[in-house]
């Protein structure tokens, strides 16, 4: 049967516009004589289906709403509002172009109080910086504003003669943006020599150079060994940006670790990411299934090591730190990282890196017949010959006669699709001339040597080690407060670079976040804008797991810790894909604020609280203490104020100032005061009948907070249980007559235990059906048989438990709701099977790590130190992020878990070691 005798219909429209739909067509069959005689029914397929619109659906970038305007910063007279990227754009969706932070000028309601450093016995520069007294009048501009060299009778020179600074010394003092992989503004002032005449000699010049105070040591050298060209082969970019032994990971005081691509390092500690170059490489790899070969060579001019402490900060950085407010302000604090980077250089080299990344078609490389090692070798040989012009380069037969080279007049490099320049250092025009162009005739002989020569005058910092910029915030006013705020800001800031916000990429591509756009880094054998295309030999269906974003930090628990978690669900591993690497839960020590509601205190490095008291005025002119508004008080309270002095009006807790909050003392002894009042921002604890208990019991409740009313045992609330603070009143309104009524559960119980009723002089179990039709409070209950939890009325639960339903376990009072209480309830049920103590307590049963409270008949967890040693239920565990093993008893395990601390049970019994 010739099937095409019966033509196909048109393809139907695609079932989806994106994300892989299907379409079908069918044969237009006429059951004629030919059809029957030639067995066409059996031979011809009647319908065909194919995949269509396989490209991923575009995800448009989505910005959140702006938060409120920050307080007006009285020092810069600006305020800001911030919004975050709720969802980055992906798969060609619309980008976000609007700013995330907006500033506007404003009229401050507070005075600008930049804390000044207390120079004690040091010299104070006009800029406010403190320097050693010995630096006055030494003929050197140690202050930076020359104020230490004013009014000098005689100057005593530090050095016997004048020395030049080390060339490009300022580069070593720049900040480095770890997440963007580039240097930023100057953080260390490397022109400051600290009154010490320390010099260093270079073999290239006869005059020694002066060593700045910030540098521990400097060593000049020039490395241009001809054979130190290194080559790397990458099947795809996932390994380039994810190289396990060279991953750039920075863990900010318990913050998330962010891996960033490293483009050159001869030290494993270096972290470098050329964002634009990596993006270029990703986009190139989308065009076709690609492999990459990278060739690189390092030239060093000098090595340097920065001092470990007492570093002299640049004026611009110091000013930026001094202008930071004590109150945490996300926009102002994260701006430090934009301007100055996230890290500073602790050691490194100045020099240049010749570094090119060649993109080859995987198909063409495979067909060339060369192994990976051979392709690397050919790239190295040809670079030596055509770029470095090394005279004694022996070109090997294999490199010129393979299928790829033969297509391009014996050149292997000309077979590349494109190259991406990662060259650093040297004059830009020479660096640009070294970049390889497809089809170009090759380089002139002196191009490389010109660039190499220019590296000496125009070096870059290469091969470096970093430390967080936060560590530099020392010996400035309020250093501890500002360090803590900067740490918090770094965690917020770094989260913006975390690809956890991206949707999973097709074909196991790895998402990477570039600004507000997610890009897909394709696995070997896949290509397309979003890695949605497969080459014929790509057969894998595995999906590697990727982390979702971290939850916010929990509050601090009784063991000085707070924690956060993330899930391996973006996507979860499927079909044999790799599990997520790294920790699911992070724990860190808490930093505590000493003053809870009085704004951020200024804590200095010596950890002393600084309280600035205005001196008492003994003159009798001025103004007496003014009368504050209702529910307000005067901040800087004293008997008499001098003319021109301001007083600040503050409001009691639960109220906030509306209007201009400063009064000024006038020459006639009166106060100039605008309209200011203290308006309530919270609800007052409601007045209820004494029998009712309010939980949580506070004086004031913030808007959105709720309370619950409860009654003594045997009674229930005769009305709603839950009330919420809205505006400055309770919803629903709380009636004065609200009271407790007798609980029918208790009436039935008589003198019997819970779940039983009196029948004559006997106690028998209640019937869940007959005796529990009345209202009783909700409990959250776990059924070990069905391995499920559910909400049950207390009466029904107790009756069923009495009827010996041992599989029912009390989790907590109230209906089941996801959260820590439910989590813990389930976990304690699991632990309870090994408990040596089972003590009945109200609805509950208390275990080894708990105590039954007499007053409330509830099980309360012991704190770990309250556990008694020993018992035969021992476990070998790992605690927190520690790697060491520890033997704990069941009480300690239960108490630690109840406190929400991480403890991993390795095996029952003592640890073996």
């Amino acid at each position: 049967c010739f099937c095409d005798h019966y033509p196909w219909s048109q393809w139907s429209s695609c079932s989806k516009t994106c994300n892989s739909g299907t379409q079908s067509r069918h044969r237009q069959i006429v059951v004629d004589k030919y059809y029957q005689e030639n067995f066409c029914e059996q031979i011809c397929s009647k319908q065909e289906t194919r995949e269509c619109n396989w490209q991923s659906c575009p995800i448009n970038c989505l910005l959140g709403d702006f938060g409120p305007w920050s307080d007006c910063d009285p020092c810069v007279e600006k305020q800001s509002k911030v919004r975050s990227v709720l969802r980055p754009s992906q798969f060609g969706g619309q980008p976000c172009t609007e700013p995330l932070v907006v500033f506007q000028p404003c009229i401050p309601s507070k005075l600008c109080k930049i804390e000044e450093a207390d120079c004690k016995n040091k010299f104070r520069c006009d800029s406010g910086r403190c320097i050693a007294r010995k630096l006055e009048c030494n003929g050197e501009n140690d202050c930076g504003d020359n104020s230490d060299e004013r009014d000098c009778g005689r100057t005593k020179a530090v050095c016997a003669r004048k020395y030049n600074p080390i060339p490009s010394v300022q580069l070593m003092g720049n900040g480095f943006h770890f997440l963007a992989g580039e240097p930023r503004g100057e953080v260390l002032d490397n022109s400051f020599t600290g009154g010490i005449c320390k010099t260093v000699k270079s073999s290239r010049t006869s005059n020694p150079y002066r060593v700045p105070a910030n540098l521990e040591n400097v060593g000049f050298e020039v490395e241009t060994a001809e054979d130190d060209l290194k080559t790397d082969f990458y099947k795809d970019l996932t390994s380039l940006g994810h190289n396990e032994n060279q991953q750039g990971s920075f863990s900010s005081q318990g913050g998330s670790s962010f891996r960033v691509p490293i483009f050159y390092s001869s030290k494993r500690s270096e972290n470098v990411n050329h964002n634009s170059a990596f993006k270029q490489a990703i986009q190139a790899s989308h065009k076709k299934d690609s492999s990459f070969i990278r060739i690189h060579k390092v030239m060093k001019v000098l090595n340097f090591t920065t001092k470990a402490k007492d570093l002299y900060l640049s004026d611009v950085f110091l000013k930026a730190l001094n202008h930071l407010p004590l109150e945490y302000n996300s926009a102002l604090y994260t701006r430090i990282f934009d301007d100055f980077g996230t890290h500073y250089f602790t050691s490194g080299s100045l020099g240049g890196v010749y570094d090119l990344l060649y993109q080859f078609s995987s198909e063409e490389l495979k067909n060339s017949g060369l192994t990976e090692e051979e392709t690397k070798h050919c790239v190295r040989i040809e670079t030596k010959k055509r770029v470095l012009f090394v005279k004694k380069t022996k070109v090997e037969h294999r490199c010129t006669t393979n299928k790829l080279s033969e297509k391009h007049e014996g050149s292997f490099l000309q077979g590349a699709e494109k190259s991406i320049s990662l060259i650093r250092g040297g004059r830009s025009e020479y660096a640009a001339a070294l970049a390889w162009e497809k089809g170009s005739s090759g380089l002139e002989e002196k191009t490389f040597s010109d660039w190499l020569e220019s590296v000496k005058e125009n070096p870059a910092v290469i091969d470096f080690e970093l430390a967080p910029i936060v560590d530099l915030v020392r010996n400035i006013p309020c250093a501890v407060t500002k360090r803590n705020n900067l740490r918090k800001a770094f965690q917020e800031y770094a989260a913006k670079f975390d690809p956890c916000q991206c949707a999973p990429c097709p074909n196991n591509g790895r998402p990477t976040l570039s600004g507000t756009e997610c890009l897909c880094v394709c696995q070997s054998g896949t290509y397309g804008e979003n890695c949605e295309r497969r080459s014929p030999d790509y057969k894998s269906n595995a999906v590697d797991g990727h982390w979702g974003c971290w939850s916010s930090w929990s509050t601090c628990d009784a063991t000085y810790k707070r924690s956060r978690t993330r899930e391996c669900s973006n996507p979860a591993p499927k079909r044999g894909g790799k599990r997520c690497e790294g920790e699911k839960r992070q724990e860190e020590d808490c930093t505590f604020s000493i003053m809870e509601n009085n704004g951020q205190p200024c804590i200095n490095d010596d950890e002393e609280m600084k309280e600035v008291n205005l001196p008492e005025i003994e003159a009798d002119s001025g103004c007496p203490q003014p009368v504050p508004p209702e529910n307000g008080f005067i901040r800087n309270e004293k008997k008499l104020y001098s003319v021109g002095e301001d007083v600040e009006i503050s409001c009691l807790t639960g109220f906030e100032t509306v209007g201009y909050q400063y009064f000024r003392c006038l020459p006639d002894g009166t106060w100039r005061q605008g309209d200011v009042e203290c308006q309530r921002t919270e609800c007052i604890k409601p007045v209820v009948q004494e029998i009712l208990t309010i939980t949580p019991f506070q004086r004031l409740y913030r808007i959105g907070e709720s309370i619950e009313l409860t009654c003594p045992k045997g009674f229930v609330v005769a009305g709603p249980l839950r009330y919420t603070c809205q505006g400055n009143s309770w919803t629903p309104p709380i009636s004065n007559s609200l009271t407790c009524e007798k609980d029918s559960l208790t009436k039935l119980k008589g003198h019997c235990q819970l779940g039983q009723k009196q029948s004559g002089s006997e106690c028998i179990c209640m019937s869940p059906e007959e005796d529990c039709s009345h209202y009783s409070e909700d409990l959250c209950v776990f059924d070990t048989d069905s391995n499920d939890y559910f909400t049950s009325p207390a009466c029904k639960f107790l009756a069923e438990k009495c009827l010996n339903n041992q599989q029912l376990h009390f989790l907590h009072i109230g209906s089941c709701q996801d959260g820590r209480q439910l989590e813990w309830g389930l976990e304690r049920t699991r632990l309870s099977s090994n408990s040596t103590k089972k003590e009945s307590c109200g609805y509950d049963t208390c275990y080894d790590w708990e105590k039954c409270t007499a007053s409330t008949s509830k099980c309360a967890c012991l704190l770990p130190p309250q556990c008694f040693k020993g018992g035969n239920q021992l476990y070998c565990v790992k605690m927190g992020s520690s790697t060491s093993e520890k033997t704990l008893n069941i009480c300690e395990v239960g108490a630690i878990r109840c406190a929400n601390r991480k403890v991993e049970i390795l095996h029952p019994g003592k640890c073996l070691a």
């Epitope: 009784a558 409270t853 704190l863 556990c867 020993g870």
Partner: antibody
Framework: EVQLVESDGGLVQPGGSLKLSCVAS????????MAWVRQGPTKGLEWVAT????????YYRESVKGRFTISRDNAKRTLYLQMDSLRSEDTATYYC???????????WGHGTLVTVSS | DVVLTQTPSTLSATIGQSVSISCRSS???????????LYWYLQRPGQSPQLLIY???DLGSGVPNRFSGSGSGTDFTLKISGVEAEDLGIYYC?????????FGAGTNLELK
């Protein structure tokens, strides 16, 4: 009956060192965590440090970390507090304390006075 | 650190009178599994502190039941129903819900 007896404190100069000890009786010493709590003339009661049964885990308040060391000798039924780099703000009566299932600081010694002054 | 504010700082009472002491916390002491680690201690003149109340409202061993504790969240109260001569001294509240453990500044109960 649970008894906790602290050694005599004394007068120490700022920057100096002192080691306090606390002998326990009336209970199985090695079965309990132990702690030091102090009561200063201005600061009131302050928890200082805690140690677990065998001394493998220790916990300190931030202001004494790196200067004070809590340790124990279960054979001698004795708890120690080694205090180095003493400051005037460390002046206080130091109590040795044992927990129970009711509270972290259920039993207290009689206390010993440490004065840091030049 | 969590700050515990006790009021009043001094309390004068006559024998047999009922009195209350308040302890207010700078943040809620109710943890996420429903436990509140708030304790009351009495320090008689020249003696060490002695546990009176644990977990807000439970009576310590051997403590007479004229002492009672109540409260939740951030507001807590110790009540003595009928003061006796042996009750004189300084009363401290203490929290262990958040690290580091902290004590209130104390309330001195004296005879009128």
């Amino acid at each position: 009956e649970v008894q906790l007896v602290e050694s005599d404190g004394g007068l120490v100069q700022p920057g100096g060192s002192l080691k306090l000890s606390c002998v326990a009786s009336g209970f199985s010493f090695s079965d309990y965590y132990m702690a030091w709590v102090r009561q200063g003339p201005t600061k009131g009661l302050e928890w200082v440090a805690t140690i677990n049964y065998d001394g493998s885990s220790t916990y300190y308040r931030e202001s004494v970390k790196g200067r004070f060391t809590i340790s124990r000798d279960n054979a001698k039924r004795t708890l120690y507090l080694q205090m180095d780099s003493l400051r005037s703000e460390d002046t206080a009566t130091y109590y040795c304390s044992r927990p129970s299932t009711e509270a972290l600081f259920a039993y207290w010694g009689h206390g010993t006075l440490v004065t840091v002054s030049s | 650190d969590v700050v515990l504010t006790q009021t009043p700082s001094t309390l004068s009472a006559t024998i047999g009178q009922s009195v209350s002491i308040s302890c207010r916390s700078s943040q809620s002491l109710l943890n996420d599994v429903g436990n509140t680690y708030l304790y009351w201690y009495l320090q008689r003149p020249g003696q060490s502190p002695q546990l009176l109340i644990y977990l807000v409202s439970d009576l310590g061993s051997g403590v007479p039941n004229r002492f009672s504790g109540s409260g939740s969240g951030t507001d807590f109260t110790l009540k003595i129903s009928g003061v006796e001569a042996e009750d004189l001294g300084i009363y401290y509240c203490m929290q262990a819900s958040h690290a580091p453990y902290t004590f209130g500044a104390g309330t001195n109960l004296e005879l009128k």
